[in-house]
Amino acid sequence: PRSIDVKYIGVKSAYVSYDVQKRTIYLNITNTLNITNNNYYSVEVENITAQVQFAKTVIGKARLNNITHIGPLDMKQIDYTVPTVIAEEMSYMYDFCTLISIKVHNIVLMMQVTVTTTYFGHSEQISQERYQYVDCGRNTTYQLGQSEYLNVLQPQQ
């Protein structure tokens, strides 16, 4: 195994709000990540950067700094939240997400995350990309893995 393994687990929760006038959707998406340190020494996770894409457009970004250190042969589960905005040229989604006649308003989002660890002045970056279903019509908490979209093009890391 590589010295540090990063596994994107899935969406933990999605909290939604709307701006009726602007026909804008605000989604606060909390994701879960497992970082495993296969080394004999402990490592420092310097930062986690994440972005969310909808229809190939970046709709949200987040960065966490000085996250944690992980002991040897240890694994840490980290939650991080990405605030996203679906607006402007994608405001047509407002109608779909607020449609009362349907119960689940799932949209497919691409979650990208990069974990940076620092080794004596040089950085190692490990990235993951996963497609996930998120309900844009209501606040939702997910069982881990429940929001998984068919990641045919994304081999398991």
């Epitope: 080394n39 040897p72 240890d74």
Partner: antibody
Framework: QVQLQQSGAELVRPGTSVKVSCKAS????????IEWVKQRPGQGLEWIGV????????KYNEKLKGKATLTADKSSSTAYMQLSSLTSVDSAVYFC???????????????WGQGTSVTVSS | DVLMTQTPLSLPVSLGDHASISCRSS???????????LEWYLQKPGQSPKLLIY???NRFSGVPDRFSGSGSGTDFTLKISRVEAEDLGVYYC?????????FGSGTKLEIK
């Protein structure tokens, strides 16, 4: 002072299991790794595996084909090695040792237990 | 697995002599942080092994300065400048860079 006190000698039947303990004292148990080493009579040393008592994370010598299972009990500062499906080739002295680590570096096995003799015989 | 080849298997010496033990690894044992984790242990009859040298050349606390370690890449050496009676026993090199970690076969330091 730092001590690793291992359990006493065992005489066991082929096909059975045995659990060897290694009780740590004189240091913060979860801040060090515990390694296990095998020595057959008149032979050299063979690395079995390692456990991080803080997390329970382990690495094993795959050549031993699942022979050993390493665990640790933080509340009693004790590491354990369970050996299963014992045969005559498992007759050996088993040592535990501690290894320190830090950010991006680690140290050597500076303190060792006295060894536990396991004899497999019918 | 990384094979650690120690020579000689037996090293007869007189007290006060210099002694040199070689340890050769079958591949580089540089760890992913740039350090080489090559260690030397001494085991006396009926005792647990004791740490002498770590990271190729660093003497463990309490180890006399007549012991020195050197080497890089795949070739490593333990030298004892003036052998004393308490130095007798079996010396093992040990690599901690590739799982499974492996010991050399041992070198028995004995009186001529």
């Amino acid at each position: 002072q730092v001590q690793l006190q291992q359990s006493g000698a065992e005489l066991v039947r082929p096909g059975t299991s045995v659990k060897v303990s290694c009780k740590a004292s004189g240091y913060a148990f979860t801040n060090y790794l515990i390694e296990w080493v095998k020595q057959r009579p008149g032979q050299g040393l063979e690395w079995i595996g390692v456990i991080n008592p803080g997390s329970g994370g382990t690495k094993y010598n795959e050549k031993l084909k699942g022979k050993a299972t390493l665990t640790a009990d933080k509340s009693s500062s004790t590491a354990y090695m369970q050996l299963s499906s014992l045969t005559s080739v498992d007759s050996a002295v088993y040592f535990c040792a501690r290894r320190g680590y830090t950010i991006y570096d680690f140290y050597a096995m500076d303190y060792w237990g006295q060894g536990t003799s396991v004899t497999v015989s019918s | 697995d990384v094979l650690m080849t120690q020579t000689p298997l037996s090293l007869p010496v007189s007290l006060g002599d210099h002694a040199s033990i070689s340890c050769r690894s079958s591949q580089s044992i540089v760890y992913n942080n740039g350090n080489t984790y090559l260690e030397w242990y001494l085991q006396k009859p009926g005792q647990s092994p004791k740490l002498l040298i770590y990271k190729v050349s660093n003497r463990f606390s309490g180890v006399p300065d007549r012991f020195s370690g050197s080497g890089s890449g795949t070739d490593f050496t333990l030298k004892i400048s003036r052998v004393e009676a308490e130095d007798l026993g079996v010396y093992y090199c040990f690599q901690v860079s590739h799982v499974p970690f492996t010991f050399g076969s041992g070198t028995k330091l004995e009186i001529k």
